[in-house]
Structures are given as C-alpha cells and as structure tokens.
C-alpha cells in the first residue's frame, strides 16, 4: 500500500436546502484506470461511512441508488455532492481515495471538510 496526497476544502456551508458540494483532488502518481472514492463522516470521535463509489477513469461515478451522494470526475478531481443534510449532520467529511487498478495500490485520505448545516428557519404560520 502506497500513500497518496488528497486535498479538499477545510470548511463548507451547506445550502439552505441541505446540499453541500466540494472537490476532492488526489495527486495520482500513475495512470490509474479504476478508482474508489469513499466519504467518511467524523463527529464526536465516531467515524461512519457516508457513501462510496468505484469508477473507471473517464466514466461517471456510480453510487448506490439510495445514496445521499452524487459525483462527477474530471482527471484527478472528484466533485462530490451530499444532499438531504440536516443541522445534526454537521461534521467533518473525509475524502478517501483508493487507486485500485492497475497495481500498485495507492491510498490517500484527506484532512476532511467541515460541513456546517443550518436547518432553515420555520416559516411563520399564516392565515389564508
């Protein structure tokens, strides 16, 4: 297993609709054809997997149908979008990139993007 540098923004504020997008960029040492991207969430020392996708270079990322993540790739960059976020989902979202094929296997883990999520203010009751 060889190490690889992964860069991602330090802080992102999700939209009022609970959507956060950020770029995860990896310094590929070679010409990988198969890449696996995993998003991990760290909150209060607990780490959980949010979503993961394996893709062939030049193709779209395919997450599971019920995943809250979508993404696109361009060269050594992956543009990740996480939706359906609520205030309780605020936390550090870590991008993990694995170059699966061809060998050698490379692994890179970013420092994480702190995603702040603000629940929208409830609309005041109105009489119609």
């Amino acid at each position: 297993c060889k190490a690889m540098h992964v860069a991602q923004p330090a802080v992102v504020l999700a939209s009022s609709r609970g959507i956060a997008s950020f770029v995860c960029e990896y310094a590929s040492p070679g010409k990988a054809t198969e890449v696996r991207v995993t998003v991990l969430r760290q909150a209060d020392s607990q780490v959980t997997e949010v979503c993961a996708a394996t893709y062939m270079m030049g193709n779209e990322l395919t997450f599971l149908d019920d995943s809250i993540c979508t993404g696109t790739s361009s060269g050594n960059q992956v543009n990740l979008t996480i939706q359906g976020l609520r205030a309780m989902d605020t936390g550090l979202y870590i991008c993990k990139v694995e170059l699966m094929y061809p060998p050698p296997y490379y692994l890179g883990i970013g420092n994480g993007t702190q995603i702040y999520v603000i629940d929208p203010e409830p609309c005041p009751d109105s009489d119609f």
Epitope: A10, V11, L13, S16, S21, A43, D119
Partner: antibody, heavy 117, light 108 residues
Framework: QVQLVQSGAEVKKPGASVKVSCKAS????????ISWVRQAPGQGLEWMGW????????NYAQKLQGRVTMTTDTSTNTAYMELRSLRSDDTAVYYC??????????WGQGTLVTVSS | EIVLTQSPGTLSLSPGERATLSCRAS???????LAWYQQKPGQAPRLLIY???SRATGIPDRFSGSGSGTDFTLTISRLEPEDFAVYYC?????????FGQGTKVEIK
C-alpha cells in the same frame, strides 16, 4: 503567515450603510470561511454571521437578517460585510475572523464604525 | 438558540494563582464546537482553546480546557501578568453561533 487586514474606521449618519472589507493572506482563501463579530463600546462579542468562501453560502444572525450582507471576492481574497439602515446602537468595532473546522483564527485588527447624527 | 452563561463575571486574583472560569450552555453543545478566546483592551480576541480541550498553536500549556455537554471550564494553572484579560467562550455547533458574556480576570 495567515493574516486578515481590515479597512479603516468609518463615521456614518443614522439610516446610512457601511461596507467593511477584510483582506486575507497566507492561506487558500476559498478553503475556509469568514465570520463577522462586533463589539459595542464596553460590551461583549456579538456574532453577526459568516460566509463560506468556497461556495458563497451565508448564515446570518436572526436579529440582523435583512440588514446585513456578507460577500467575498475570490480574485482579491477579500471578504466584505455591508450593514444597512444604520442606527446608533450599531456603533461598534467590527471584526472579521477566519472560520476553520472548529475555530475562529486569526482575527482582523477590527474596524470602528461610529453611527452619529 | 443556545445561550452561554459565563461565571464569575469578574475574577480577582494575584499572579501565580490558579484561575477557573466556567461556561454553561442552555442546551447540550458538542465538545467539538466549543472554543475559548482571550481579549485584551484595544486588541482583537485571540483563540486559546478549540474543541473544548485542544490548545491553539502557540498557546502556553498553563491554559487548559475541559468539559462536555452543558458545562465547560477554562483553567489557567498559574496566572502570569499577561494573562489578565477578558475571556469568552463560544459555541458553533448549532446556529446561531454564540459567545458567552465574558469573564474578566483582574489583578487583586
């Protein structure tokens, strides 16, 4: 080193607007956020809101909603805070601060805004 | 909305003494999102502690933070002359982010 430099002191009349700038250097501007905090004379710190320089999304304190606008210019690594319909109780030192994963650091030197007729 | 209440309002101590500052939240705050700042007259605040207990870069080890849930503490083990200032706690785990009203540490 990481630094935030704010614009100079302002004197404004009630009802006017003020726009304070905060120029960042020493780090990747779009990777972080900028928060604005004010401090009335002899008082404590009041959080006004913040902007994510990465995507421009904002979160404002409820009491200032509708009067405050925070923006960034990523070409010059500068954040701006505009406050409209100024009142005498808006007289304060206004600070910008870099928002990290779980801290405000560093802070700008502060900008004194005086609202007086 | 989470309200932070700091106590005492003023702490009168001598150099070399230990200072214990309290910050109480009206609702539970994730310790990841609790910070302490120091402010001296005419200066901008300076980050001391983040994540409730992690010292910021360049902060002497006489400063320490602890606590969880609704009760947090900043301790200065031995006061130095330059430590006499106002200290603020802050939460940024849920919006609106908020500061406590401050504790002034003054020379006795």
């Amino acid at each position: 080193q990481v630094q935030l430099v704010q614009s100079g002191a302002e004197v404004k009349k009630p009802g006017a607007s003020v726009k304070v700038s905060c120029k960042a250097s020493g780090y990747t501007f779009t990777s972080y956020g900028i928060s604005w905090v004010r401090q009335a004379p002899g008082q404590g710190l009041e959080w006004m809101g913040w902007i994510s320089a990465y995507n421009g999304n904002t979160n404002y304190a409820q009491k200032l909603q509708g009067r405050v606008t925070m923006t960034t210019d990523t070409s010059t690594n500068t954040a701006y805070m505009e406050l409209r319909s100024l009142r005498s109780d808006d007289t304060a030192v206004y600070y910008c601060a870099r928002v990290g994963a779980n801290w405000f650091d560093p802070w700008g030197q502060g900008t004194l805004v005086t609202v007086s007729s | 909305e989470i309200v932070l209440t700091q106590s005492p309002g003023t702490l009168s101590l001598s150099p070399g003494e230990r200072a214990t500052l309290s910050c109480r939240a009206s609702q539970s705050v994730s310790s990841s999102y609790l910070a302490w700042y120091q402010q001296k007259p005419g200066q901008a605040p300076r980050l001391l502690i983040y994540g409730a207990s992690s010292r910021a870069t360049g902060i002497p080890d006489r400063f320490s933070g602890s606590g969880s849930g609704t009760d947090f503490t900043l301790t200065i083990s031995r006061l130095e002359p330059e430590d006499f200032a106002v200290y603020y706690c802050q939460q940024y785990g849920s919006s609106p982010w908020a500061f406590g009203q401050g504790t002034k540490v003054e020379i006795k």
